[in-house]
């Protein structure tokens, strides 16, 4: 679709003559008829296939024709066409004399031909005017012409339609050849696909306008490359969406079981030692002088038996007082007035004199202690067994009976069931009191993650045309992420090209 434009510039008919040789009376009141048609080697009568137009009276005999953009007598003359410009044409320009109406001479009776010219040739679409001058014996015509495309038509034959737009159907301007030039931030054949934020993850992110990066379910962050843990997860993270991989010290499916109660809650009071023992489990080992589950109760000052050599202890508000038996003195009845001659050592202890006979010392046999070997040794009084182990006196020695999950002379070593890597298929292992517990990734179950869940929706390959399958928050749901050119919940439909342009 385009316009053939003809600019009439000057017409000369100095003698004011008609084509039949007679003069015009009183002068030749001149108008023009233009016929544009397809190329003919020999111009013939017949319809003006590319269009025709007439002018009002433009002057008398000889005159210059000025450009005029509105009203009657527009110059250049416009001959619009709504087909592909073939590049060739035939043009017939006739000058006529009218005795009648200036504005509509075409309809007046008695019009007479002054002269005519015929040109045939080729003409490319373009903005440049082609100038020409035709002379015959009586007249001279100076003119120029060109072919330009109508608005929104482009190309060397004005056949390519392109209308710039910035809406849901596209965001582009038109190049001189009619091709689309996408506005900044848009791409695609019709410039209808936004260019997402630089670095936005190809599968996990998408955008509906330029420089956005909206994340698909299960992903977060500026570039949608960080996963979101399961919505029931409490103290865990993820490496894939909806996972719940427990932070250190937490266990269970949703990482809500406290495996490090001692650190998280500090339940043991008065400087006592806390030992973890399974989910929410712990043991407090009290310092001397304290008792209770959390060592929160203070024992009486006499509870530690501070009086030696059979002295009896009396509690005061903030202290105690030892009443010594005959022959002993000192704060704890630790000093004796006896000598070895008094046979003070019991249970087979042997006596040694000290300080020139002023005192003595007992050397006790195994299993006995005290100044006079009067006490049987209790090797468990120092609470030597860690992590809730039970202390047992065994003659001259003692042993620790450890709780499940602990070993070592003093139950100080934690047996890690997880060291054997019992969890299959990438499961996360947690040491619990009753053995290891595996947190399984999506698609697997069982105590050791050894069972593949057959109803993992992605296992059946439900997505077509090379789409990527993601399980949703649960294994029986899936999402297909379609490659470019496909749509549908399973990416089963190709995107059909629109039957016609949507403008």
């Amino acid at each position: 679709s385009g316009i053939f434009q003809l600019r009439l510039q000057e017409f000369a008919n100095e003698r004011g003559m008609l084509a039949n040789g007679r003069p015009c009376e009183p002068g030749c009141r001149t108008f023009f008829r233009i016929c544009l048609k397809h190329y003919q080697a020999t111009f013939s009568e017949g319809p003006c296939t590319f269009g025709n137009v007439s002018t009002p009276v433009l002057g008398t005999n000889s005159f210059v024709i000025r450009d005029k953009n509105s009203g009657s007598g527009r110059n250049p003359l416009q001959l619009p066409f709504n087909f592909t410009w073939p590049g060739t044409f035939s043009l017939n320009i006739q000058a006529w004399h009218t005795p009648g109406d200036d504005l509509r001479p075409e309809t007046s009776p008695g019009n007479s031909l002054i002269s005519q010219i015929i040109i045939q040739g080729s003409l490319a679409v373009g903005k440049n005017w082609k100038s020409d001058e035709q002379n015959n014996t009586l007249t001279r015509l100076r003119y120029s012409y060109r072919v330009v495309c109508s608005d929104n038509y482009y190309g060397d034959s004005c056949s390519r339609l392109c209308k710039k737009r910035d809406d849901h159907f596209g965001h582009y301007e038109c190049q001189p050849d009619g091709s689309l030039s996408c506005l900044p931030g848009w791409t695609g054949k019709y410039c209808d696909q936004p260019i997402c934020l630089s670095g936005c993850h190809e599968q996990n992110g998408y955008c509906s306008k330029p420089d956005e990066c909206n994340c698909r379910p299960g992903w977060q962050g500026p570039l949608c490359n960080e996963c979101i843990p399961h919505n029931g997860c409490r103290h865990g993270t993820c490496t894939i969406p909806w996972q719940c991989a427990c932070d250190e010290g937490w266990g269970g499916l949703f990482c809500d079981q406290d495996l490090n109660y001692c650190t998280h809650h500090s339940p043991c009071k008065n400087g006592s030692t806390c030992s973890n023992s399974g989910p929410r489990g712990y043991t407090c080992t009290c310092l001397p002088g304290y008792t209770g589950e959390h060592c929160e109760l203070e024992l009486s000052k006499c509870a530690s038996n501070p009086c030696r050599n059979g002295g009896s202890c009396k509690d005061h508000e903030n202290s105690y007082h030892c009443l010594c038996p005959p022959g002993y003195y000192g704060q704890h009845c630790e000093h004796s007035t006896l000598t070895c001659a008094d046979s003070p050592c019991f249970n087979g202890g042997s006596c040694r004199e000290r300080n020139q006979g002023a005192s003595y010392a007992c050397e006790c046999p195994p299993n006995f202690t005290g100044s006079n070997c009067e006490k049987k040794v209790d090797r468990c009084t120092s609470n030597p067994c860690a992590n809730g182990g039970q202390c047992l006196n065994r003659g001259p020695s003692r042993t620790c009976r450890c709780r499940p999950g602990f070993t070592g002379t003093h139950c100080e070593l934690h047996i890690s069931d997880c060291a054997r890597s019992p969890c299959a298929h990438g499961g996360t292992c947690h040491d619990l009191e009753n053995g290891p517990v595996c947190t399984c990734p999506a698609g697997f179950s069982g105590r050791r993650c050894e069972v593949r869940i057959t109803n993992d929706a992605c296992a059946s390959g439900p997505c077509f045309n090379g789409a990527t399958c993601y399980t949703g928050l649960s294994p029986n749901n899936f999402v297909c992420n379609c490659p470019y050119g496909f749509v549908g919940s399973r990416c089963e439909f190709p995107v059909g090209l629109p039957p016609s342009f949507p403008w």
């Epitope: 909206n214 919505n231 928050l473 749901n477």
Partner: antibody, heavy 118, light 107 residues
Framework: EVQLVESGGGLVQPGGSLRLSCAAS????????MSWVRQAPGKGLEWVAS????????TIGDSVKGRFTISRDNAKNSLYLQMNSLRAEDTAVYYC???????????WGQGTLVTVSS | DIQMTQSPSSLSASVGDRVTITCRAS??????LAWYQQKPGKAPKLLIY???NLADGVPSRFSGSGSGTDFTLTISSLQPEDFATYYC?????????FGQGTKLEIK
């Protein structure tokens, strides 16, 4: 037990500002994305803003874009909503929630009422 | 933005009744749909996520179904504590959007 406790609501004049806070406990706050959702009196729920867990990437709803900002302090287990240029239509109960704009909102606070009126 | 339309907007039922609430999305949201329960003066509570998964601590009388654009919340045998307003929400497309709510009242 997961707990979210909002504070900072109240009466404010149009054009004024307010800062809402949300104190979180019972879960590892820094591991999870957080959001604000609001509910105008007698109306339905409307998502306002979300923030990612580690890099604090904020996403703001169109109705409040340019006026509200969401932020978090993982060391203090706290989520914030700075509201500027308040309008009458911002009057609502504002809920702090654990979740992102593309995930379910798993846990909610009790809400704090913001009234914008002259 | 995706429009979420719930029906009915209000509903009267009796204890023991089976109740169904529907939610329609203006375009395909796959299975990325959640249901919430809200009682007067209280915060919403997550009931169901991913169309049919029960949230932690939610009774088994609640169930969800559907995919694509049409979804359903079913309460198999209504209990006195179930009278509340129910909202659906899609989280497939940005921004997340909620339905207008369905108020469940005692008959």
């Amino acid at each position: 037990e997961v707990q979210l406790v909002e504070s900072g609501g109240g009466l404010v004049q149009p054009g004024g500002s307010l800062r809402l806070s949300c104190a979180a406990s019972g879960f590892t706050f820094g591991n999870f994305p957080m959001s604000w959702v609001r509910q105008a009196p007698g109306k339905g729920l409307e998502w306002v803003a979300s923030i990612s867990s580690s890099d604090s990437w904020a996403t703001i709803g169109d109705s409040v874009k340019g006026r509200f900002t969401i932020s978090r302090d993982n060391a203090k287990n706290s989520l914030y909503l700075q509201m500027n240029s308040l309008r009458a239509e911002d009057t609502a109960v504002y809920y702090c929630s654990r979740g992102y704009y593309n995930s379910p909102f798993a846990y909610w606070g009790q809400g704090t009422l913001v009234t914008v009126s002259s | 933005d995706i429009q979420m339309t719930q029906s009915p907007s209000s509903l009267s039922a009796s204890v023991g009744d089976r109740v169904t609430i529907t939610c329609r999305a203006s375009e395909d949201i796959y299975s990325n749909l959640a249901w919430y329960q809200q009682k007067p003066g209280k915060a919403p509570k997550l009931l169901i996520y991913d169309t049919n998964n029960l949230a932690d601590g939610v009774p088994s009388r609640f169930s969800g179904s559907g995919s694509g654009t049409d979804f359903t919340l079913t309460i198999s045998s209504l209990q006195p504590e179930d009278f509340a307003t129910y909202y659906c929400q899609q989280y497939n497309n940005y921004p997340p959007t909620f339905g207008q709510g369905t108020k469940l009242e005692i008959k």
